[in-house]
């Protein structure tokens, strides 16, 4: 426990102290006091540096004194022979004796008392920044007017913090400016502007004088600006060393002025104002900004319009422009949106044609459509080349966005017909010689394919069966072959309105207008064994002359069989109508004069016994196109005859082209258009 006073006596005092002794005393007086230690008696064996026996006085780590020998008072009025004054409240006294004493020594007697210390003057380090006040057992610090004592109870500073500036313009100065600023102070000023405005600080060099930096370059007094995670400064010295205009890019700024105890100067003065937050003029590729300005600030709105061929894609929606607003944080809204090249996407496929997979489907890319040659050609022109246009469509120079249409090539057999042995009088043929040949199984007859959806035949073939089963693509009509070929399903049968329907068709003598069209449910796929025949043109070039040659084909009656298994064909000439009239009807069902002959009929045959016969009805009489020798057109349809192996009568197709075209147009489907 600390005590105010005390006595310390050497061992056995006042008798002689023993040899080989080491004893220590720890003196402690209350905090705020020093210790006055004085000796009234001292009789210790003398030695150099008190090496043998001694009394040692230690304060902290410092030896205050080491005593030996005999002392007596110099003052007759005072018993004190030696004394020590320490400004600390702790002291240690250590007594040591060696192994022998030549004489008898009585040791020492000492006393200590607590003494007041003057903290304000007794120490090298002044405890108070301004005023120090001593009292018995302690001290306190005090401050001049307008200063306040900090929590450490030692330092004084000015009350210069806590100011918040919210006006868009203002002036801030150090305390007492232009008089010297207070020492030992930390001044914090806050500028808080509305979001969207940045604090801009303006200083003049001459309005700044702050204690200069030390030799290491560290500011002793400093001015610092903090804006979010950005810091400007610290600044110090004579004349402002930083930029005279500080754009903080923030609506919040903290100004911190820190001073130490020495070297006060006049300080500083600054102005600030709020600038609308600028947004950078960003380089957005492939676009135009409207309005165009040198500088954009908070609340400015721009319309960013993509150049032709570019679009902004947000989710699944493509647009050509978007709006962006300069936001309070100095960033543009919608900054993620970009003008990307328009993507026309995978080009649509077309029926009976193809488009190569494009390397790119972006703006400017080029694709080419082709038709499945040689069976289809591009009907609507344009060359099939399309480019990806700015509107996101594949566009052709001629057709625009309309897709090309691949339509069947007509009248071109894959293999030309060559007459072999005479068979009534015909030759074996292959379906590739007559790819337009259609087989009707009930009644056994023929027809001609004229496009993907239509079959041309004789009216008498379909008058008794409005749902005929037809086949294309097979040379043989053996069942196993037909099972492998293409079966055609009718949707509707259109018989020419001029064809007279009879109660008893077997007794017919009038075959005028013997023509019908069958509309198919599904389009026919063309190929080497299935391909349409052309229709005649309406010009006089397509008027047949006597002797003009035509080809007939079918599975009708031959000399050997009632029905042919494999396709037969013959080449025969056009003959005058009278030649057909002159032939006697083989099995007349009426008077010979009753048979009707009209200009709607073509007479052909009579040469080498080549003729069509029962079962060939409806098949085409195919003639070489006068304007394109590579093609055949259906000049006639096998209709009737007086006698197989002589002359036969064929419906003159040229007379019905208008009816055919009208019927097809009126009964087409959207798919076909």
């Amino acid at each position: 426990e600390p005590t105010m006073y005390g006595e310390i006596l050497s061992p056995n005092y006042p008798q002689a102290y023993p040899s080989e002794v080491e004893k220590s005393w720890d003196i402690e007086v209350p905090e705020g006091y020093g210790i006055h230690l004085y000796f009234t008696h001292l009789d210790i064996e003398l030695s150099e540096n008190c090496a043998y026996d001694s009394v040692q006085i230690i304060s902290g780590d410092t030896e205050e004194g080491r005593l030996c020998g005999q002392r007596s008072s110099n003052n007759p009025h005072s018993p004190i022979v030696e004394e020590f004054q320490v400004p600390y409240n702790k002291l240690q006294v250590i007594f040591k004796s060696d192994f022998s004493n030549e004489e008898r020594f009585t040791g020492f007697a000492a006393y200590y008392v607590a003494t007041d210390i003057n903290e304000c003057t007794d120490f090298v380090d002044v405890p108070c920044s301004h005023f120090c006040n001593n009292f018995i057992g302690g001290y306190f610090c005090s401050c001049p007017p307008e200063y306040f004592l900090h929590d450490d109870m030692k330092n004084c500073g000015v009350n210069c913090s806590g100011d918040v500036f919210t006006a868009l313009i203002g002036e801030i100065a150090s305390p007492n400016y232009p008089k010297p600023y207070p020492e030992n102070s930390r001044c914090e000023y806050q500028i808080r502007l509305e979001k969207g405005f940045q604090v801009v600080v303006t200083l003049r060099r001459e309005d700044f004088d702050v204690e200069a930096a030390d030799s290491a370059g560290n500011c002793l007094d400093s001015l610092v600006f903090v804006a979010g995670d950005r810091q400007f400064g610290p600044y110090c010295g004579h004349g402002f060393p930083g930029p005279l205009n500080i754009e903080t890019k923030s609506n919040a700024l903290d100004i911190i002025f820190q001073t130490d105890l020495t070297g006060q100067k006049k300080g500083w003065k600054l102005r600030y104002h709020g600038d609308p937050m600028p947004c950078p003029k960003e380089d957005t590729p492939n676009s135009v900004w409207e309005p165009a300005k040198a500088k954009y600030v908070f609340r400015d709105v721009v319309q960013i319009t993509c150049l032709d061929g570019f679009e902004v894609v947000e989710g699944r929606v493509g647009a050509t422009s978007f709006y962006s607003t300069c936001q309070s944080n100095g960033k543009w809204s919608n900054s993620k949106l970009k003008c990307q090249p328009v993507d026309c996407g995978i080009p649509e496929s077309i029926e009976n044609g193809k488009v190569e997979d494009p390397e790119s489907t972006l703006f400017g890319s080029v694709i080419r459509y082709t038709c499945e040659e040689p069976y289809y050609y591009m009907e609507n022109g344009g060359g099939g080349e399309y480019h990806c246009a700015g509107n996101g469509s594949w566009v052709n120079e001629v057709l625009g966005p309309e897709l090309p249409k691949c339509v069947p090539v007509c009248g071109v057999p894959r293999e030309p017909f060559e007459e072999k042995q005479r068979i009534i009088g015909g030759s074996d043929a292959d379906i590739k010689n007559f790819p337009w040949q259609v087989f009707f199984d009930n009644p056994w007859a023929g027809g001609a394919l004229i496009n993907e959806y239509w079959v041309l035949t004789a009216a008498h073939v379909v008058e008794g069966n409005r749902e005929p089963t037809m086949y294309v693509g097979s040379t043989s009509v053996q069942t196993s072959r037909l099972a492998k070929s293409k079966m055609l399903t009718p949707e509707h049968v259109f018989i020419h309105p001029g064809w007279k329907l009879l109660e008893v068709p077997e007794g017919r003598t009038n075959f005028d207008n013997d023509i019908a069209l069958v509309r198919l449910k599904d389009p026919v796929k063309m190929g080497p064994t299935v391909s349409p025949i052309c229709l005649p043109g309406t010009s006089s070039d397509y008027n047949l002359m006597d002797g003009d040659l035509g080809l007939i084909s079918g599975w009708g009656r031959t000399e050997k069989r009632d029905r042919a298994v494999r396709l037969k064909a013959a080449r025969l000439p056009v003959a005058p109508l009278r030649k057909c009239k002159e032939v006697k009807v083989e099995k007349p069902t009426a008077d010979a004069e009753a048979y009707v002959f009209t200009p709607n009929m073509i007479c052909a045959g009579g040469e080498k016994g080549m003729d069509s016969c029962k079962g060939d009805s409806g098949g085409a009489f195919a003639v070489q196109d006068p304007n394109d020798k590579t093609k055949f057109y259906a000049a006639g349809l096998v209709s009737w005859g007086p006698q197989c192996g002589t002359y036969g009568l064929y419906t003159r197709v040229k007379n019905y082209v208008d009816w055919i075209m009208k019927t097809m147009q009126e009964n087409s489907t959207p798919r076909e258009d």
């Epitope: 056994w444 089963t469 009509v477 196993s480």
Partner: antibody
């Protein structure tokens, strides 16, 4: 009118071969496609194969592949079916049949030839 | 090869009965199906071809229906001459196959 006349009944030992003929009258073999069908006693009909004149190849049922040979002699309008490595289960009536036209499977059947395989 | 499954294998019926025999193909055969009637010791006789077409000379009491994989032969009113074995046959592929047969016997 097409008619098919088949060769007479045969009795064969297991392991032997049999050749059944089928003569066409009223038409030429070149215009026809001949099929062969057999029927074991009390059992169902079993298609064996055919010559396809369009492709010029003979098609056999998997079951008979390697054991059956179908040939034609167009000069005599006769079709032949030879079955080798006979076993008792080959005992059956063997029919030649002409393929039909325009969706009819078979037109004319021969009268059948009974082949008996017995040791 | 295409398998043909006929049912029932045996059918007992009386004169005047309506009889139905079904045939199922293991894959689609479109309408390429025929029905035959066979009497003991005779070659089969074609009744129906292309699933529903009646062969000429065959009584109209016989009818066929179906397409794809399911087919039916119907005898609207069974006659004494109709007791026989009936076979279905597919000819969609060159490798023709028959059903195992349905024997129609007197009840």
């Amino acid at each position: 009118e097409v008619q098919l006349v088949q060769s007479g009944a045969e009795v064969k030992k297991p392991g032997a071969s049999v050749k059944v003929s089928c003569k066409v009258s009223g038409d030429t073999l070149t215009e026809l496609s001949m099929h062969w069908v057999r029927q074991a006693p009390g059992k169902g009909l079993e298609w064996m194969g055919t010559f396809d004149p369009e492709e010029g190849e003979t098609i056999y049922a998997q079951k008979f592949q390697g054991r059956v040979t179908m040939t034609e002699d167009t000069s005599t309008d006769t079709a032949y079916m030879e079955l080798s490595s006979l076993r008792s289960e080959d005992t059956a009536v063997y029919y030649c049949v002409t393929e039909g036209l325009a969706g009819r499977p078979y037109d004319v059947w021969g009268q059948g030839t009974l082949v008996t395989v017995s040791s | 090869d295409i398998q043909m499954t006929q049912s029932p294998s045996t059918l007992s019926a009386s004169v005047g009965d309506r009889v139905t025999i079904t045939c199922r193909a293991s894959q689609s055969i479109s309408s390429w199906l025929a029905w035959y009637q066979q009497k003991p010791g005779k070659a089969p006789k074609l009744l129906i071809y292309k699933a529903s077409s009646l062969e000429s000379g065959v009584p109209s009491r016989f009818s066929g229906s179906g397409s794809g994989t399911e087919f039916t032969l119907t005898i609207s009113s069974l006659q004494p001459d109709d007791f026989a074995t009936y076979y279905c046959q597919q000819y969609n592929s060159y490798k023709l196959t028959f059903g195992q047969g349905t024997k129609v016997e007197i009840k």
